[in-house]
């Protein structure tokens, strides 16, 4: 039984598919909030990409010890609109700062149970987990 | 032996840590190229985020059947500079369209070997894999 992704020995517990495959998206711990006040809404001329962007964002740590990876980061937009390329500080209402989402594959640790229902260590269960990756300056949607 | 992340039964193979942990980044299959000609360099007023962005991008599939997740997508910038918010087509040289990179946790399928060197199914080996997530409109770096 080397049927990947069981990740268990072929002479192990053939009735168990220990790495369960479930693709139900898992919501993040907190809703992705816009955070327009905690840090000044400006585009820097140095530093990392998220501070030089005209749709700047910060990262918030989401840690879960029963998940792989245990540390995920959610982007939080610092401005509702894009920052002017000219000044780096004034907002341009012609552009919106929008969160870019991604359903990331993660694995959760779950107790495994054998044929007789007894606890047989831990299995990894695959889930899709929605993370916000970045804030992007976009042209507002024109409704048809 | 329920020492996570072996993901194997506690009465399994205590000498094997079946989910091996190695955090050496793995390069993507192809270098992240800038792709300024394959799609027109413009910001749409509808459609998905990557086409409405003033730093638009397309996605390139990276599939590896021995990796979890098997499908990853790399962003490829369509413009070297940001597109004007006013016109949605002309480029504004005051802004650069830059790739946002992320070291994503992935798992590779590897043959496992028991104490006697015999093949015991498959293990999952954790690696960090660099993916480009999106293209972001940034103010150019001012060198001090």
């Amino acid at each position: 039984y080397s049927h990947w992704p069981s990740c268990c020995p072929s002479k192990g517990y053939p009735s168990e598919e220990l790495l369960r495959w479930s693709t139900v998206p898992v919501p993040p711990l907190k809703p992705a909030s816009l955070d327009f006040h905690s840090v000044s809404c400006r585009a820097s001329e140095d530093g990392p990409l998220n501070s030089r962007a005209i749709s700047p964002w910060r990262y918030e740590l989401d840690r879960d010890l029963n998940r792989l990876p245990q540390d995920l980061y959610h982007a939080r937009c610092l401005c509702p609109h894009c920052v002017s390329l000219q000044t780096g500080s004034h907002m341009d209402p012609r552009g919106n700062s929008e969160l870019l989402y991604h359903n990331q594959t993660v694995f959760y640790r779950r107790p495994c149970h054998g044929k007789k229902g007894n606890h047989k260590g831990y299995c990894l269960e695959r889930r899709l987990y929605r993370v916000s990756l970045a804030c992007v300056c976009v042209r507002p949607r024109v409704m048809g | 032996y329920s020492h996570w992340p072996s993901c194997c039964p506690s009465k399994g193979y205590p000498s094997e840590e079946l989910l091996r942990w190695s955090t050496v980044p793995v390069p993507p299959l192809k270098p992240a190229s800038l792709d300024f000609h394959s799609v027109s360099c413009r910001a749409s007023e509808d459609g998905p985020l990557n086409s409405r962005a003033i730093s638009p991008w397309r996605y390139e599939l990276d599939r590896d059947l021995n990796r979890l997740p098997q499908d990853l997508y790399h962003a490829r910038c369509l413009c070297p500079h940001c597109v004007s918010l006013q016109t949605g087509s002309h480029m504004d040289p005051r802004g650069n369209s830059e790739l946002l990179y992320h070291n994503q946790t992935v798992f590779y399928r590897r043959p496992c070997h028991g104490k006697k060197g015999n093949h015991k199914g498959y293990c999952l080996e954790r690696r960090l894999y660099r993916v480009s997530l999106a293209c972001v409109c940034v103010r150019p770096r001012v060198m001090g």
Epitope: R58, Y59, P69 | P5
Partner: antibody, heavy 122, light 107 residues
Framework: EVQLVESGAEVKKPGASVKVSCKAS????????MNWVRQAPGQRLEWMGL????????SYNQNFKGRVTLTVDTSASTAYLELNSLRSEDTGVYYC???????????????WGQGTLVTVSS | DIQMTQSPSSLSASVGDRVTITCSAS??????LNWYQQKPGKVPKLLIY???SLHSGVPSRFSGSGSGTDFTLTISSLQPEDVATYYC?????????FGQGTKLEIK
């Protein structure tokens, strides 16, 4: 040798702000998250938050009601703690502490700065 | 927040004694518990991580045990240099929380 060196003692008035620095050396600064822990006189240790120098990602103790801001300067391998709207009960020693981890079982503060005494008094 | 409670708050023992300090969590934290030692006027030092793993350089007379909500730090044979305050800390969930500390003295 891993070292965390904090800035000197501060005396502040209620309502003011304080910014404490923590200079790291002897390891890859961006490879480890940095925690900040406070110890008021005769009190237990109190975790304030952490920051990942690699991407600036943070997690804060909400008990500080948004008064804490953590930042880093990776080029100087330095972490900063800023505490606003100071009150007398904020008097104490403020520690930075590097967080070691193995990726699945433990997160532990293995190296600590020498501490910065902040006194809030009118 | 997860509350951590240590007992006793202080204790006095003789050199060579076996000393036990307990730490109780307000909810199950699996084995996600660390112990720190803080000598008078000094900085806290990591002693034990993940309930029972000894940090490098820590003498083998220190050991940790427990799971779920109840944890123990044991010093098998107390030495004069062990005079300190000991803190447990959970890291299952943010915010990290510490016990109130146990002050250990020599009789």
């Amino acid at each position: 040798e891993v070292q965390l060196v904090e800035s000197g003692a501060e005396v502040k008035k209620p309502g003011a702000s304080v910014k404490v620095s923590c200079k790291a050396s002897g390891y890859s600064f961006s490879g480890y998250t940095m925690n900040w822990v406070r110890q008021a006189p005769g009190q237990r240790l109190e975790w304030m938050g952490l920051i990942n120098p690699y991407n600036g990602g943070t997690s804060y103790n909400q008990n500080f009601k948004g008064r804490v801001t953590l930042t880093v300067d990776t080029s100087a391998s330095t972490a900063y703690l800023e505490l606003n709207s100071l009150r007398s009960e904020d008097t104490g020693v403020y520690y930075c502490a590097r967080e070691d981890y193995d990726g699945y079982l433990y997160f532990a503060m293995d190296y600590w700065g020498q501490g910065t005494l902040v006194t809030v008094s009118s | 927040d997860i509350q951590m409670t240590q007992s006793p708050s202080s204790l006095s023992a003789s050199v060579g004694d076996r000393v036990t300090i307990t730490c109780s969590a307000s909810q199950g934290i699996s084995n996600y518990l660390n112990w720190y030692q803080q000598k008078p006027g000094k900085v806290p030092k990591l002693l034990i991580y993940y309930t029972s793993s000894l940090h490098s350089g820590v003498p083998s007379r220190f050991s940790g045990s427990g799971s779920g909500t109840d944890f123990t730090l044991t010093i098998s044979s107390l030495q004069p240099e062990d005079v300190a305050t000991y803190y447990c800390q959970q890291y299952l969930a943010f915010p990290y929380t510490f016990g109130q500390g146990t002050k250990l003295e020599i009789k």
